[in-house]
């Protein structure tokens, strides 16, 4: 049995997959900050997790996905206020009893040191220094991401 949060996540991901392919993103749009091969947008207002997920979707983006601890640290370096929390694209899947990214993959237990409980209706937020489990209904800020298309240099055969 999927929770309402899981259904919302699946529905939005499916609708994103149905949309027509768009040309690759070479530069970050206005207001988005480049972090390596991603563009990040930090919200100013607050929302529960599912509304944050939906807002990113309307901007043709997703809630932030963090590949590893190194990417977490670099993202946290952009958060200069210790008191601010941001939703990312990770929530607890009751059916699989595990933390699940909105792209369908599961959290590698070594990637993030989560403070708080892993239980139903729990979603993950990050601050400047830590990673927290919060009730998904909590209203905090959020981070959207867009992937930049890597620019591949053309290789010409020797003449």
């Amino acid at each position: 049995q999927k929770s309402s949060i899981e259904k919302c996540s699946v529905d939005i991901q499916q609708s994103r997959n149905k949309t027509t392919e768009r040309p690759g993103l070479l530069n970050c749009p206005i207001y988005w900050q480049q972090l390596r091969e991603k563009c990040l947008l930090f919200s100013h207002t607050v929302n529960p997790w599912n509304n944050s997920l939906a807002d990113c979707s309307t901007k043709e983006s997703s809630l932030l996905l963090i590949r590893d601890k190194d990417e977490l640290i670099h993202t946290q370096n952009l958060i200069r206020d210790k008191a601010i929390l941001f939703w990312i694209g990770l929530n607890f899947s009751l059916s699989e009893k595990n933390w699940k990214w909105i792209n369908g993959s599961f959290l590698n237990s070594n990637d993030l040191e989560i403070r708080g409980d892993a239980k139903e209706n729990s979603c993950i937020s990050i601050s400047q220094t830590s990673v927290y489990s919060e009730y998904c209904s909590t209203e905090i800020r959020w981070i959207c991401q867009k992937e930049l298309t890597p620019v591949r240099n053309k290789v010409y055969p020797d003449s």
Partner: antibody
Framework: QVQLQESGPGLVKPSETLSLTCTVS????????WSWIRQPPGKGLEWIGY???????NYNPSLKSRVTISVDTSKNQFSLKLSSVTAADTAVYYC????????????WGQGTLVTVSS | EIVLTQSPGTLSLSPGERATLSCRAS???????LAWYQQKPGQAPRLLIY???SRATGIPDRFSGSGSGTDFTLTISRLEPEDFAVYFC?????????FGQGTKVEIK
């Protein structure tokens, strides 16, 4: 209620640097984009650039080589420096709050006229 | 950069009449990120409409925005005496954000 107040000299000599500060009250600067816009007398509006509280900036390409915007979160202020000014830089300079792709320039300072003249 | 062209340059109308202001973009405005501002002499601009059709906080419902792509319209359903001012459109979907040259709504 968020309020913005520009301050700085009203007269700058040609080739010198124009320096303005915007003080934000009624809200924290640790969010939003903080923008500068100018309006030459009797003319339209021109966006100069913005800064995010973490130091991320974006400038109008037409002014980029001469513009620096900085932020001081401890004082709830952000500043504009425009170097090598000419008479064409004479304008009313406004600071404003910008919520980016959510809501654009929703709070403005009252503006300050800067005249470039020797 | 995106060039915004507003028309007409001046609109002469009487209180109670309907005002229709046009803003045309040189290329499509991303996600309808288009705003309208009102400016009175000696004052800073005031945000009226954002996202092409959403009214900003505290803006009366006689102001409405519409359009997408390259063509946008600001409509004032019944002009009040305080509505006579200059109106600017702005796109904020592409860098740099740009403004139209303005439409002056004056009393006939």
């Amino acid at each position: 209620q968020v309020q913005l107040q520009e301050s700085g000299p009203g007269l700058v000599k040609p080739s010198e640097t124009l320096s303005l500060t915007c003080t934000v009250s009624g809200g924290s600067i640790s969010s939003y984009f903080w923008s500068w816009i100018r309006q030459p007398p009797g003319k339209g509006l021109e966006w100069i650039g913005y800064i995010y509280y973490n130091g991320h900036t974006n400038y109008n390409p037409s002014l980029k080589s001469r513009v620096t915007i900085s932020v001081d979160t401890s004082k709830n202020q952000f500043s504009l420096k425009l170097s090598s000014v000419t008479a064409a830089d004479t304008a009313v300079y406004y600071c404003a709050r910008d919520s980016g792709p959510w809501v654009p320039l929703d709070y403005w300072g009252q503006g300050t006229l800067v005249t470039v003249s020797s | 950069e995106i060039v915004l062209t507003q028309s007409p340059g001046t609109l002469s109308l009487s209180p109670g009449e309907r005002a229709t202001l046009s803003c045309r973009a040189s290329q499509s405005v991303i996600s309808s990120y288009l705003a309208w501002y009102q400016q009175k002499p000696g004052q800073a601009p005031r945000l009226l409409i954002y996202g092409a059709s959403s009214r900003a906080t505290g803006i009366p419902d006689r102001f409405s925005g519409s359009g997408s792509g390259t063509d946008f319209t600001l409509t004032i359903s019944r002009l009040e005496p305080e509505d006579f001012a200059v109106y600017f459109c702005q796109q904020y979907g592409s860098s740099p954000p740009t403004f139209g040259q303005g439409t002056k709504v004056e009393i006939k």
